[in-house]
């Protein structure tokens, strides 16, 4: 059999091999498509099927406007002038080229070492569904699930049967890599002799993640003075992306605790007294230590705030300007 690819909405003519070009003709066309349940034999006199498949005077079959439901098999059986039976067999597939794909909601810039959504590539009105691919600086981008993530969605229009494809690209640019990457997206139907459709490229600037703007050590209760058996909460607040690892120091020695931006001291006793600070370790900027705070365990009504603890502000914070 012969494979035929026809564009949706366009006419298609299938020739009946061996059929005399003029009547009298002995021929039979039958089809098995989305419009039939089994084989449908077409009447040579014409009829209700003529709007979708009509036998022409020369014996060929005309599909005036191919649609998705016309995909299938078409067969002609003809007797030629010498009385020999000749068969033709066609496998028809249809396609529709979508509009030019577009990158919607593109990023304005990217930050190195963190996940960034580049944008969403959208293609509307294809058949069959086809595929969307991303390119970086003209080279195909292969999603690896780590530095390059692609989230895809395919929807089919309930009436037309055409597809809409969406592909969302997220990347983690490496530090010290290209500073102005160019991203583009292409749609491919996967049919022979059909070139991919490309979006307009977008060029983005990669920003190195800046150092933390400051570390704040928040203490609760304010002032760092707590009654025996009370609870102290120390919070290391840092405005860096991605959030760095936070370790704790007491009286100049690291505390053997898992990294956490919060240090909880429940049921404090005099052994918990001391000077506390937090150390934020950022992959690209090394460690940064907060100003220290003093924790004192005393009966309520004791003398005022200890040296090194928070003074007049009443905010229970110490800020370090970088």
């Amino acid at each position: 059999g012969q494979n035929i690819t026809a564009r949706i909405g366009e006419p298609l003519v299938l020739s009946c091999k061996g059929a005399p070009k003029k009547p009298p003709q002995q021929l039979e066309w039958k089809l098995n498509t989305g419009r039939t349940e089994a084989w449908k034999v077409l009447s040579p006199q014409g009829g209700p099927w003529d709007s979708v498949a009509q036998i022409l005077p020369n014996g060929s079959l005309l599909l005036p406007a191919t649609g998705i439901v016309d995909e299938g098999t078409f067969r002609c059986r003809a007797t030629n002038r010498r009385g020999k039976e000749v068969k033709s067999n066609y496998r028809v597939r249809v396609y529709q080229i979508p509009g030019k794909p577009e990158i919607v909601d593109p990023a304005s810039e990217l930050t190195a070492s963190v996940p960034n959504k580049v944008g969403t590539c959208v293609s509307e009105g294809s058949y069959p569904a086809g595929t969307l691919s991303w390119h970086l600086d003209g080279k195909l981008l292969i999603p690896d699930g780590k530095e390059t993530l692609v989230k895809e969605e395919t929807r089919r229009h309930p009436e037309t049967g055409l597809f809409t494809l969406r592909s969302e690209l997220t990347v983690i640019p490496t530090q010290g890599g290209t500073t102005h990457p160019t991203f583009s997206c292409s749609f491919s139907l996967g049919l022979p002799r059909r070139r991919p459709l490309n979006t307009a490229p977008i060029q983005l600037r990669v920003r190195e993640p800046g150092p933390p703007e400051g570390i704040q050590l928040l203490v609760e209760p304010e002032g760092g003075i707590v009654a025996p058996g009370g609870t102290v909460t120390l919070t290391c607040a840092i405005s860096a992306q991605p959030p760095p690892q936070v370790h704790w120091i007491k009286d100049g020695a690291p505390l053997p605790l898992a990294p956490s931006p919060v240090l909880l001291l429940p049921e404090v006793g005099h052994a918990d007294e001391g000077t506390y600070s937090c150390v934020a370790t950022h992959p690209s900027h090394g460690p940064q230590e907060s100003p220290p705070v003093s924790i004192r365990v005393t009966e309520t009504g004791d003398e005022g705030p200890a040296e090194g603890s928070v003074g007049e502000s009443g905010l229970g914070t110490l800020a370090l300007a970088l």
Epitope: R35, A38, P48
Partner: antibody, heavy 119, light 107 residues
């Protein structure tokens, strides 16, 4: 709103001619096949004639072939049925309907027009 | 030519009943069968298209089904407004053929 309005019916003697018209509105006329269907008093429905959307293919049952001619004027969104050599058995209510091919099976009908063939 | 043998020719039923009208096609017509309702003095109205699909605006108590060459129209929980003649039609081959009709009346 889709509307099909027939006209041209009446009383006619056997052997004479009559032309029915059907003016349509509310849809793109030249996108659809059109068909005439008739109903004899107290009897069933009978297909009379169909025409494709461009007007270059027409279809008839043997009972009216060579006597009736279906045609259309797409510019005027009008369907016609020219009936010649009328017989008493052609007495019926004639309906203009949208469709006639496998894609559209008579989804809209006119109100019908009565044709009486009698001497 | 294809024959569409419709039965019964008439039926007298009670409100709330479920009724089924059938048409048998003398040869294969695939899915290309429609059902029409016709009230006295009115034009036919398409109820079911391509054997099983409910036409726009038709109440869901109407349904169409097919088993081989037998096509059925079912009305569940019949209402007074359903009193009418019902016709099947094959539109797969010329000449297009209607069934002889079924008159549905209330007892």
């Amino acid at each position: 709103e889709v509307q099909l309005v027939e006209s041209g019916g009446g009383l006619v003697q056997p052997g004479r001619s009559l032309k029915l018209s059907c003016v349509v509105s509310g849809f793109t006329f030249n996108n659809y096949w059109m068909t005439w269907i008739r109903q004899t008093p107290g009897k069933g429905l009978e297909w009379v004639a169909s025409i494709n959307n461009s007007g270059d293919n027409t279809y008839y049952p043997d009972s009216v072939k060579d006597r009736f001619t279906i045609s259309r004027d797409n510019a005027k969104s009008t369907l016609y049925l020219q009936m010649n050599s009328l017989r008493s058995e052609d007495t019926a209510t004639y309906y203009c309907t949208r469709g006639g091919d496998i894609t559209t099976g008579f989804d809209y009908w006119g109100q019908g027009v009565m044709v009486t063939v009698s001497s | 030519d294809i024959q569409m043998t419709q039965s019964p020719s008439s039926m007298s039923v009670s409100l709330g009943d479920t009724i089924t009208i059938t048409c048998r096609a003398s040869q294969d017509v695939g899915i290309y069968v429609n059902w029409f309702q016709q009230k006295p003095g009115k034009s036919p109205r398409r109820m079911i298209y391509r054997a099983t699909n409910l036409a726009d605006g038709v109440p869901s108590r109407f349904s169409g089904s097919r088993s081989g060459s037998i096509y059925s129209l079912t009305i569940s929980s019949l209402e007074s407004e359903d009193v009418a003649d019902y016709h099947c039609l094959e539109f797969d081959e010329h000449p297009l053929t209607f069934g002889s009709g079924t008159k549905v009346e209330i007892k």
